[in-house]
Amino acid sequence: HSDGIFTDSYSRYRKQMAVKKYLAAVLGKRYKQRVKNK
């Protein structure tokens, strides 16, 4: 969804947490893949 109303501080915090979690998952997968490929 677009950001419109999602600018309040709690929604901003949740968005940050979601992005952090997503990046951690992606980087974790990449790391595992690199280890596997070695």
């Epitope: 969804h1 677009s2 109303i5 999602f6 709690y10 915090y13 949740r14």
Partner: antibody, heavy 123, light 110 residues
Framework: EVQLVESGGGLVQPGGSLRLSCAAS????????MSWVRQAPGKGLEWIGI???????WYASWVKGRFTISRDNSKNTLYLQMNSLRAEDTAVYYC?????????????????WGQGTLVTVSS | DIQMTQSPSTLSASVGDRVTITCLAS??????LAWYQQKPGKAPKLLIY???TLASGVPSRFSGSGSGTEFTLTISSLQPDDFATYYC????????????FGGGTKVEIK
């Protein structure tokens, strides 16, 4: 079993204070945003506030500093400190776990609820 | 401040009926809406989130729809276990709000 159990409710005089506890089991409280919601007898659900994993808090506009949400992750327990209690604070108080946030859905929902604890404010 | 208005407040229906409950948001909340079921003396139970996604273990006779400011909860064929009170909740914001919940709809036996 994943559950929340509230305690600490009871009879309190107007102007008095009470601290409610919510013990979490089957999951780590530190990993979740948590909330308190209350329900006056025969009335609807009324949100009180939220504490996030960083211990930042958000409260309903009507709270006006009378209630404070905190947590002790070492005890896996959530708290609600209630001060300057009034007759209209008489209600069942529920703690609730909030949904995880995802990149394309960071809205908040109440996914797990305790059984509630009754607070009666009366002289 | 986002206000949630539910209608009707009470609904009389019979087993097998198709039941629809409406929830209106005072501003655009996109699809950030949940529905809960509550039975007397029990805690609420999450039924639907993200406006239309069924929570785990919820029967398929329940469905949710809508986006923006208007949302509906539909029970396709009312069962005896469905007589309860239903609440909508906006999940879009928590800054300076009075209450993210609607006022509730009691579904009673006709």
């Amino acid at each position: 079993e994943v559950q929340l159990v509230e305690s600490g409710g009871g009879l309190v005089q107007p102007g008095g204070s009470l601290r409610l506890s919510c013990a979490a089991s089957g999951f780590s409280l530190s990993s979740y945003d948590m909330s308190w919601v209350r329900q006056a007898p025969g009335k609807g659900l009324e949100w009180i506030g939220i504490i996030n994993t960083n211990d930042d808090t958000w409260y309903a506009s009507w709270v006006k500093g009378r209630f404070t949400i905190s947590r002790d992750n070492s005890k896996n327990t959530l708290y609600l400190q209630m001060n300057s209690l009034r007759a209209e604070d008489t209600a069942v108080y529920y703690c609730a776990r909030i949904s995880d946030a995802y990149v394309f859905d960071y809205a908040y929902y109440f996914t797990l609820w305790g059984q509630g604890t009754l607070v009666t404010v009366s002289s | 401040d986002i206000q949630m208005t539910q209608s009707p407040s009470t609904l009389s229906a019979s087993v097998g009926d198709r039941v629809t409950i409406t929830c209106l948001a005072s501003q655009n909340i996109y699809n950030s809406l949940a529905w809960y079921q509550q039975k007397p003396g029990k805690a609420p139970k999450l039924l639907i989130y993200r406006a239309s996604t069924l929570a785990s273990g919820v029967p398929s006779r329940f469905s949710g729809s809508g986006s923006g400011t208007e949302f509906t909860l539909t029970i396709s064929s009312l069962q005896p276990d469905d007589f309860a009170t239903y609440y909508c909740q906006q999940g879009a914001g928590a800054d300076n709000i009075g209450n993210p919940f609607g006022g509730g709809t009691k579904v009673e036996i006709k």
